[in-house]
């Protein structure tokens, strides 16, 4: 229904706290360099204005669209061109082009320092002094580093953060209470960020139809007892919510997500028997819980998929009559039978089925042609199954750090032109799949591994798009989203690459490495490993292991030495020489 004042409508629906949080996220995601104080001032002005519209919807400018109101605010910021360069040109455009322009200038890899967590005492002090400002800072810092973070979900993580601080700041040992809990939230939030970015990429590159197909598969796996009409309704609503968030319409997105959660909880009987626990929770927790609710029990009496989609004489007629609906029912029926498959795999199977019908339905005897389609799925299913087995075996053998290193070597060989920091970040993220997925029960491994890898590789593609350097990466990133992971997996050593010359300074280390946290030490060592591979792309695993073991031993020795500086300056050159010899 149309409202006289959109801003008043959203303020009323969301309430002041969520309204302010979402506006702060929106501004922080658009203008990623502005300080918290600058954004907080704008948020307060927008909120005050919203309140005047709530009081009188006919007041001046209250009928303007949210894009117009927010865009005007952003464009009024002083020194916009000095701070943001050509983004300022967006302000010469009219809506909706202006908003599109802002979206195009979102930076997936902004040059901001890593978000450092203050030490426990300091954190608790500033939290107690002003919890609202503290949480505002959190929203601002996360949103500007992750310009596509799913806004209502970020409010959920802020709420989690708040609860942890409230609990731990009352403890005697704040540090040991806070650290594991906040690490857990951070890990989940980072995964949420790459997953949402993947959804926005799907929407931006391939449109709503592609996202809706993803949603149908995912929802059918989770709610196998819901009928196709119900799944279609949920997928349509979910597509709208995600389109809004990806498009920067965060107030609408959060409002519609709340509506969807309400609908699901009111219609549990036709959706799933597993929703009640989620539905008992308050809004943010409820929506989060519903987004990762466990799969409902599959109906026991599902007929074989072949009956309707291979053996039926009407296949081509049904396909001709409504292609999208017929393919949608295929995806629904296949997905509800296979919670053990990844969404990416299910979409590849649906694509294969569509291609088969396109070819076979044009033949004189279609049934004879498409009769073998399910058998043709087998290699598509085996490939990711083998990937999971091979990688989980390797993870179990090497542990997370060793597994990351194995992936780093593999990916540096595939795309040695990619910058070392990007390769290290990608390998570290890809390597976490082991800890995240390989410990799960067998039937949950494949969906966990492949859908997580796809999201990480989407980030690799986004970073590579900014500065394309590898034809291998460009090739894999240009295809459809669901083909990316198999494409990357199939890449081998890039034969066109001219190895980097050996530079001693790349492998020269100083005593400051000894005081670094373990994570930073690992990154230093992994940086060296990537550089070694760039120098010798065809080095054997054995050669690389020798060098890395030597390197670890060198660090251990010098960091334990009484005179660390002397040890690094005398033993360092010896290490470099041994490395060169080992790789010769």
């Amino acid at each position: 229904e149309a409202h006289k004042s959109e801003i008043a409508h959203r303020y009323n629906d969301l309430g002041e706290q969520h309204f302010k949080g979402l506006v702060l996220i929106a501004f922080s995601q658009y203008l990623q360099k502005c300080s918290y104080d600058e954004h907080a001032k704008l948020v307060q002005e927008v909120t005050d204005f919203a309140k005047t519209c709530v009081a009188d919807e006919s007041a001046a400018n209250c009928d303007k669209s949210l894009h117009t109101l927010f865009g005007d605010k952003l464009c009024a910021i002083p020194n916009l061109r000095e701070n943001y360069g050509e983004l300022a040109d967006c302000c010469t455009k009219q809506e909706p082009e202006r908003n599109e322009c802002f979206l195009q200038h979102k930076d997936d890899n902004p040059s901001l320092p890593p978000f450092e967590r203050p030490e426990a005492e300091a954190m608790c002090t500033s939290f107690k002094e002003n919890p609202t400002t503290f949480m505002g800072h959190y929203l601002h810092e996360v949103a500007r580093r992750h310009p596509y973070f799913y806004a209502p979900e970020l409010l959920y993580y802020a709420e989690q953060y708040n609860e942890i601080l409230t609990q731990c700041c009352a403890e005697a040992d704040k540090e040991s209470c806070l650290t594991p809990k906040l690490d857990g939230v951070k890990e989940k939030a980072l995964v949420s960020s790459v997953r949402q970015r993947m959804k926005c990429s799907s929407m931006q590159k391939f449109g709503e139809r592609a996202f809706k197909a993803w949603a149908v598969a995912r929802l059918s796996q989770t709610f196998p007892n819901a009928d196709f009409a119900e799944i279609t309704k949920l997928a349509t609503d979910l597509t709208k919510v995600n389109k809004e968030c990806c498009h920067g319409d965060l107030l609408e997105c959060a409002d519609d997500r709340a509506e969807l959660a309400k609908y699901m909880c009111e219609n549990q009987a036709t959706i799933s028997s597993k929703l009640q626990t989620c539905c008992d929770k308050p809004l943010l927790k409820k929506a989060h819980c519903l987004s990762e609710v466990e799969h409902d029990t599959m109906p026991a009496d599902l007929p074989a998929i072949a009956a309707d989609f291979v053996e039926d004489q009407e296949v081509c007629k049904n396909y001709a009559e409504a292609k999208d609906v017929f393919l949608g029912t295929f995806l629904y029926e296949y997905s509800r039978r296979h919670p053990d498959y990844s969404v990416s795999l299910l979409l590849r199977l649906a694509k294969k089925y569509e291609a088969t019908l396109e070819k076979c339905c044009a033949e004189a005897n279609p049934p004879a042609c498409y009769g073998t389609v399910l058998a043709e799925f087998q290699p598509l299913v085996e490939e990711p199954k083998n990937l999971v087995k091979t990688n989980c075996d390797l993870y179990e053998k090497l542990g997370e750090y060793g597994f990351q290193n194995a992936i780093l070597v593999r990916y540096t060989q595939k795309a040695p032109q990619v910058s070392t920091p990007t390769l290290v970040e990608a390998a570290r993220n890809l390597g976490r799949v082991g800890t995240k997925c390989c410990t799960l029960p067998e039937d949950q491994r494949l969906p966990c591994v492949e859908d997580y890898l796809s999201a990480i590789l989407n980030r690799v593609c986004l970073l590579h798009e900014k500065t394309p350097v590898s034809e291998h990466v460009t090739k894999c990133c240009s295809g459809s989203l669901v083909e990316r992971r198999p494409c990357f997996s199939a890449l081998t050593v890039d034969e066109t690459y001219v190895p980097k010359e050996f530079k001693a300074e790349t492998f020269t280390f100083h005593s400051d490495i000894c005081t670094l946290p373990e994570k930073e030490k690992q990154i230093k060592k992994q940086t060296a490993l990537a550089e070694l591979v760039k120098h010798k792309p065809k080095a054997t695993a054995e050669q690389l292991k020798t060098v890395m073991d030597d390197f670890a031993q060198f660090l251990d020795t010098c960091c334990k030495a009484a005179d660390k500086d002397t040890c690094f300056s005398t033993e360092g050159p010896n290490l470099v020489t041994r490395c060169k010899d080992a790789l010769a």
């Epitope: 004489q313 009407e314 081509c316 007629k317 396909y319 009559e321 033949e363 004189a364």
Partner: nanobody
């Protein structure tokens, strides 16, 4: 909405010819193989002939081979069945279908072969 409308049927004497047409709409005609199916009074449907989307490939039931010719004009979204040397046992309602379907989703056109 898919629509198939057959025409060209009628009463003919044995040995004579008829040409049936099927006008198609509501789908990408050239992307689909098409068939002619017939149903004699009191009997089940019987497949007669099929043609690929491009028209390059055709199939016939043994009972009509050498007498009937299936063809199509994709620019006109129309399927044809040229029936020569008609026999009394060819009497039936003829209807066109998409792909390998035998089920009837149109009125069909009645062909009666009788002296």
């Amino acid at each position: 909405k898919v629509q198939l409308v057959e025409s060209g049927g009628g009463l003919v004497q044995p040995g004579n010819s008829l040409r049936l047409s099927c006008a198609a709409s509501g789908f990408t005609f050239g992307s689909f193989g098409m068939s002619w199916v017939r149903q004699a009074p009191g009997k089940g449907p019987e497949w007669v002939s099929s043609i690929s989307g491009s028209g390059s490939d055709t199939l016939y039931a043994d009972s009509v081979k050498g007498r009937f010719t299936i063809s199509r004009d994709n620019s006109k979204n129309t399927l044809y069945l040229q029936m020569n040397s008609l026999r009394p046992e060819d009497t039936a309602v003829y209807y066109c279908t998409i792909g390998g379907s035998l089920s009837r989703s149109s009125q069909g056109t009645l062909v009666t072969v009788s002296s």
